[in-house]
């Protein structure tokens, strides 16, 4: 506990001190005081450098004195024989004696008192930057006018901080400019402009004079500019050493002017202004900027338009242009958007055709559609080649974006029919010879496939069963084979309006207009065993002449059995209608004269007993197309006959082409593309 005064006596004082003693006293007076230590008696064994016995006075790490021997006062009015004055509030006194004393020594008596120190003058380092004021037990610092005492209560500085500049243009100078700036000051100025403007600082070299750097290059006084995480400076010296125009790229700038205690100069003056934040003219590939400028600044808006074949994809939506705004941070809005090549996507598949998987589906890519040859061909032309257009569609030169249509090739059997022997008198056939042949199982009859959705047959086949079950693609009509073939399901039966419906069909003598169409529920898939027959053209080329040959096929009665198990066929010549009239009806249901013969009927047969018979009805009388010898067309349909194995009558299909086309058009369902 600090005290203001005290007494220190050697051991056994005033008796002789003992040998081999070491004793210390720690003196402490209150802070702000020094210590005056004085000895009134001193009697210690004398030795060189007081090596044997001694009293030692230590202040901190410094030995203030070491005493031995005998002393007496020089002043008769004062008992003090030795004294010490220290400006510190702590002192240590150490007494030591060795192992022997030649005489009897009495030691020492000493006193200490706390004394005031003058902090303003007693120390090498001046405690105050400006004015120092001493008082008993301490001191205080004070400042000249316009200066203020810092929080450390020692340093004075000018009050030059806290100014915030928000105007878009302004001037800032060091305190007292152009008079010397204050020493020992830290001046902070803040420029805060609206977002989107950058602070640009301009200085003139002659407007800058700040205490120069030391030998190590460190500025003693310094001017520093801080913009976000960027710093310009520190700057010092005579004449501004930095760039005379500083673009900070920020709307906020802190200016810090730091001075030390010495070397004041005139200082500095600067101007600043707010520049709209520039945005870089970016190179955005495959696009055009509108408007085009050399420089873009805050709030500028550009429309970036993609070149043809390129698009902006944002989410799932594709656009050809977008707007970008120069933002307050010097960056463009929508900068992530890019003009990418238009992607036409995976091309749509087409019925009965294919498109090879494209290597690329981007703008300019080319794809080719093909039909499943030889059963389908491209109806609407265009060659099947499409390119990815700028609008994101696959486009064909002829069809535009319309997809190609693969339609069945008609009238071309995969294998030609060859008569192996002498239907009645006919030959075994394969369904590949007559891929258009349709089998009706109730009643047992035939028909001809004319396209994906339509079957042509005789009216008398379907008049009693408007929901016939049909089969295609099988040579044999055994149940086991039909189970593995394609069954066709009817949607609607259209009987020619000229066909007379009878209450007792068995007694029919008039087979005029014996023609009907069956619309199918589902399209038929074509292949080697299923493929349509062509319809006759309307030109005179398709008028039949006597002797013209045609092919008939079916599973009707043969010489051997009532129903053929495997398809039979025969080649027959067209004959004059009178030949059919002349044949006696085998099992007449009326007078021979009652049977009607019209120009809507073709008479054919009469050669080698080859003829159609019961169960062949509705099948095609197929004739080679006069304009394309590779194809067959349905010139007739098996209708009726006076007697199997003689001549037969066939519905003349050419006379019904208009009705067929009209019926199909009026009852077609739009293709589900």
């Amino acid at each position: 506990e600090p005290t203001m005064y005290g007494e220190i006596l050697s051991p056994n004082y005033p008796q002789a001190y003992p040998s081999e003693v070491e004793k210390s006293w720690d003196i402490e007076v209150p802070e702000g005081y020094g210590i005056h230590l004085y000895f009134t008696h001193l009697d210690i064994e004398l030795s060189e450098n007081c090596a044997y016995d001694s009293v030692q006075i230590i202040s901190g790490d410094t030995e203030e004195g070491r005493l031995c021997g005998q002393r007496s006062s020089n002043n008769p009015h004062s008992p003090i024989v030795e004294e010490f004055q220290v400006p510190y509030n702590k002192l240590q006194v150490i007494f030591k004696s060795d192992f022997s004393n030649e005489e009897r020594f009495t030691g020492f008596a000493a006193y200490y008192v706390a004394t005031d120190i003058n902090e303003c003058t007693d120390f090498v380092d001046v405690p105050c930057s400006h004015f120092c004021n001493n008082f008993i037990g301490g001191y205080f610092c004070s400042c000249p006018p316009e200066y203020f005492l810092h929080d450390d209560m020692k340093n004075c500085g000018v009050n030059c901080s806290g100014d915030v500049f928000t105007a878009l243009i302004g001037e800032i100078a060091s305190p007292n400019y152009p008079k010397p700036y204050p020493e020992n000051s830290r001046c902070e100025y803040q420029i805060r402009l609206e977002k989107g403007f950058q602070v640009v600082v301009t200085l003139r070299r002659e407007d800058f004079d700040v205490e120069a750097a030391d030998s190590a290059g460190n500025c003693l006084d310094s001017l520093v500019f801080v913009a976000g995480d960027r710093q310009f400076g520190p700057y010092c010296g005579h004449g501004f050493p930095g760039p005379l125009n500083i673009e900070t790229k920020s709307n906020a700038l802190d200016i810090i002017f730091q001075t030390d205690l010495t070397g004041q100069k005139k200082g500095w003056k600067l101007r600043y202004h707010g520049d709209p934040m520039p945005c870089p003219k970016e190179d955005t590939p495959n696009s055009v900027w509108e408007p085009a400028k050399a420089k873009y600044v805050f709030r500028d808006v550009v429309q970036i338009t993609c070149l043809d074949g390129f698009e902006v994809v944002e989410g799932r939506v594709g656009a050809t242009s977008f707007y970008s705004t120069c933002q307050s941070n010097g960056k463009w809005s929508n900068s992530k958007l890019k003009c990418q090549p238009v992607d036409c996507g995976i091309p749509e598949s087409i019925e009965n055709g294919k498109v090879e998987d494209p290597e690329s589906t981007l703008f300019g890519s080319v794809i080719r559609y093909t039909c499943e040859e030889p059963y389908y061909y491209m109806e609407n032309g265009g060659g099947g080649e499409y390119h990815c257009a700028g609008n994101g569609s696959w486009v064909n030169e002829v069809l535009g974006p319309e997809l190609p249509k693969c339609v069945p090739v008609c009238g071309v059997p995969r294998e030609p029919f060859e008569e192996k022997q002498r239907i009645i008198g006919g030959s075994d056939a394969d369904i590949k010879n007559f891929p258009w042949q349709v089998f009706f199982d109730n009643p047992w009859a035939g028909g001809a496939l004319i396209n994906e959705y339509w079957v042509l047959t005789a009216a008398h086949v379907v008049e009693g069963n408007r929901e016939p079950t049909m089969y295609v693609g099988s040579t044999s009509v055994q149940t086991s084979r039909l189970a593995k073939s394609k069954m066709l399901t009817p949607e609607h039966v259209f009987i020619h309006p000229g066909w007379k419906l009878l209450e007792v069909p068995e007694g029919r003598t008039n087979f005029d207009n014996d023609i009907a169409l069956v619309r199918l529920k589902d399209p038929v898939k074509m292949g080697p065993t299923v493929s349509p027959i062509c319809l006759p053209g309307t030109s005179s080329d398709y008028n039949l002449m006597d002797g013209d040959l045609g092919l008939i096929s079916g599973w009707g009665r043969t010489e051997k059995r009532d129903r053929a198990v495997r398809l039979k066929a025969a080649r027959l010549p067209v004959a004059p209608l009178r030949k059919c009239k002349e044949v006696k009806v085998e099992k007449p249901t009326a007078d021979a004269e009652a049977y009607v013969f019209t120009p809507n009927m073709i008479c054919a047969g009469g050669e080698k007993g080859m003829d159609s018979c019961k169960g062949d009805s509705g099948g095609a009388f197929a004739v080679q197309d006069p304009n394309d010898k590779t194809k067959f067309y349905a010139a007739g349909l098996v209708s009726w006959g006076p007697q199997c194995g003689t001549y037969g009558l066939y519905t003349r299909v050419k006379n019904y082409v208009d009705w067929i086309m009209k019926t199909m058009q009026e009852n077609s369902t739009p293709r589900e593309d």
């Epitope: 079950t469 149940t479 189970a483």
Partner: antibody
Framework: EVQLVESGGGVVRPGGSLRLSCAAS????????MSWVRQAPGKGLEWVSG????????GYADSVKGRFTISRDNAKNSLYLQMNSLRAEDTALYYC??????????????????WGKGTTVTVSS | DIQMTQSPSSLSASVGDRVTITCRAS??????LGWYQQKPGKAPKRLIY???NLQSGVPSRFSGSGSGTEFTLTISSLQPEDFATYYC?????????FGGGTKVEIK
């Protein structure tokens, strides 16, 4: 040439079982239905059972229903008749015969156009 | 079940005779009827199918007719090899039924 050869006949006690087989050749077996017909000594023909081309449809005479089972293995071109709970009145010459079925939805049957020579089954204690 | 009644059960005839055998169905069977010939110790052989259709390879002296419930097998001129037992078979529905048979013997 169409050939049907029956086997598996023999003597069996009442209540016993037998399995008859019919091996087919000379035609596409799985295109045809098949029938079993029997003839008791000195008696007329009696249809026993029939099966369609793929085995999905079968029929039986009232006299054997619940005791006999007809089946076929198209891979082996074979027809079978499993006879259980045999009775004395089942004693007969058993024939297998070929049946033709035409049409896909509306059927036309042509039964028993070819026959085997038969196999004899005797049920006796 | 449909029952088939065949008559006569037997008949005697001479070579060259015209022979007629009748089969009657207990209910209408359209034309789903066949005729079979069986000789002693042999398997039956089909002569006629679908009431009137002659089996391939069968002589044309054999013919069938009828529809519904009444059916006839006719041998226009009996030949020595025709002496046998004849059966009708209905196959309009399961269970199939044979007639009782007609034995044609030499007079």
């Amino acid at each position: 040439e169409v050939q049907l050869v029956e086997s598996g006949g023999g003597v069996v006690r009442p209540g016993g079982s037998l399995r008859l087989s019919c091996a087919a050749s000379g035609f596409t077996f799985d295109d045809y239905g098949m029938s079993w017909v029997r003839q008791a000594p000195g008696k007329g023909l009696e249809w026993v059972s029939g099966i369609n081309w793929e085995g999905g449809s079968t029929g039986y005479a009232d006299s054997v229903k619940g005791r006999f089972t007809i089946s076929r293995d198209n891979a082996k071109n074979s027809l079978y008749l499993q006879m259980n709970s045999l009775r004395a009145e089942d004693t007969a010459l058993y024939y297998c015969a070929r049946d033709e079925q035409l049409g896909g939805n509306h059927y036309y049957y042509y039964y028993m156009d070819a026959w085997g020579k038969g196999t004899t089954v005797t049920v006796s204690s | 079940d449909i029952q088939m009644t065949q008559s006569p059960s037997s008949l005697s005839a001479s070579v060259g005779d015209r022979v007629t055998i009748t089969c009657r169905a207990s209910q209408g069977i359209r034309n789903d009827l066949g005729w079979y010939q069986q000789k002693p110790g042999k398997a039956p052989k089909r002569l006629i199918y679908t009431a009137s259709n002659l089996q391939s390879g069968v002589p044309s002296r054999f013919s069938g007719s009828g529809s519904g419930t009444e059916f006839t097998l006719t041998i226009s001129s009996l030949q020595p090899e025709d002496f046998a037992t004849y059966y009708c078979l209905q196959y309009a529905s399961y269970p199939l039924k044979f007639g009782g048979g007609t034995k044609v013997e030499i007079k």
